[in-house]
Interface confidence: low
């Protein structure tokens, strides 16, 4: 059946050394261990991590998220993935798609990511 | 230990084609997008083609585009690359390379010759 | 197409040298960047991922910086197996673009 993909709606913020999570899911839920889920990074379509025949593969992997990347999957059963990146850099900074595939149908949702210099940043108050 | 062994070279006149292999063994070649990069004699490293760990995503280089094709076949552990329409300009040792982006790990590299 | 410029073309160097090879990039490439060492009638070998990730089994005396479009390979301390031609290849964009070559030669 088909189904929508949907990440966040505002840019998710992060600290350069830190890790952030970058949710998505399908609506109508539906379990989707049996799908293809990914992550890729526009416009060159570079592949931040993947998810397929149940379980991760690096093989497309590209370098620069090579052992940086997790895939949270413990609702996946319901259609919620997170995608997990340690020891976010600068240059992570900027869009991300979320793509679940089933069999040839594909649905995706852009997100984006803000990464901000720790020693610039104050807390309020 | 990773090994990629190509083969299939020759020489072919303009015009001819030709079908590269590539055995890989030592590593799960089903997990790994692959590629093809050429050197023409005496020259620098030209990237041709890469194909995705399912053989559903090939991209190009735009001197190959429309007359050589990229595929693979997992069950055989091999990686082809079908070369058609070829003019003296492909002349070059062909070497496939493990991975999309950062090459890893070369074959030998196999001579074509384009001459008439 | 992103152009990839090395330089020098060729140096010559002795064992114990400490070595520096330049790589421009015509436009930014963040750290999209990796170098590769080849010797005559051998295929390529990767030295370095990333702008400056040492590929496993590469000798530390090999290191790799930069980013954006300027990006350096400095050999610390040449050793004999060192001579041969190195390459840098940018990953930023499609298609994937070597460098001219770098000969590395015996003084």
């Known amino acids: 059946g088909q189904f929508r993909v949907i990440g966040p709606r505002h840019p998710i913020r992060a600290l350069v050394g830190d890790e952030v999570e970058l949710p998505c899911r399908i609506s109508p839920g539906k379990n989707a261990t049996g799908m293809e889920v990914g992550w890729y990074r526009p416009p060159f379509s570079r592949v931040v991590h993947l998810y397929r025949n149940g379980k991760d593969q690096d093989g497309d992997q590209a370098p620069e998220y090579r052992g940086r990347t997790e895939l949270l999957k413990d609702a996946i059963g319901e259609g919620k993935v997170t995608l997990r990146i340690r020891n976010v850099r600068f240059s992570d900074e900027g869009g991300f798609t979320c793509f679940f595939r089933d069999h040839s149908y594909q649905e995706e949702a852009a997100m984006e990511l803000k990464v901000e210099d720790p020693f610039y940043w104050v807390s309020p108050g | 230990e990773v090994q990629l062994l190509e083969s299939g070279g020759g020489l072919v006149q303009p015009g001819g084609s030709l079908r590269l292999s590539c055995a890989a063994s030592g590593f799960t070649f089903s997990s790994y997008a692959m590629s093809w990069v050429r050197q023409a004699p005496g020259k620098g490293l030209e990237w041709v083609s890469t194909i995705s760990t399912y053989g559903d995503y090939t991209t190009y280089a735009d001197s190959v585009k429309g007359r050589f094709t990229i595929s693979r076949d997992n069950s055989k552990n091999t990686l082809y690359l079908q070369m058609n329409s070829l003019r003296a300009e492909d002349t070059a040792v062909y070497y496939c390379?493990?991975?999309?982006?950062?090459?890893?790990?070369w074959g030998q590299g196999t001579l074509v010759t384009v001459s008439s | 197409d992103i152009q990839m410029t090395q330089s020098p073309s060729s140096l010559s160097a002795s064992v114990g040298d400490r070595v520096t090879i330049t790589c421009r990039a015509s436009q930014s490439i963040s750290s999209y960047l990796n170098w590769y060492q080849q010797k005559p009638g051998k295929a390529p070998k990767l030295l370095i991922y990333s702008a400056s990730y040492l590929q496993s089994g590469v000798p530390s005396r090999f290191s790799g910086s930069g980013s954006g479009t300027d990006f350096t390979l400095t050999i610390s301390s040449l050793q004999p197996e060192d001579f041969a031609t190195y390459y840098c290849?940018?990953?930023?964009?499609?298609?994937?673009?070597f460098g001219q070559g770098t000969k590395v030669e015996i003084k």
């Open positions: 390379a493990k991975g999309s982006y950062t090459f890893d790990y």
């Open positions: 290849q940018q990953s930023n964009a499609t298609p994937s673009t």
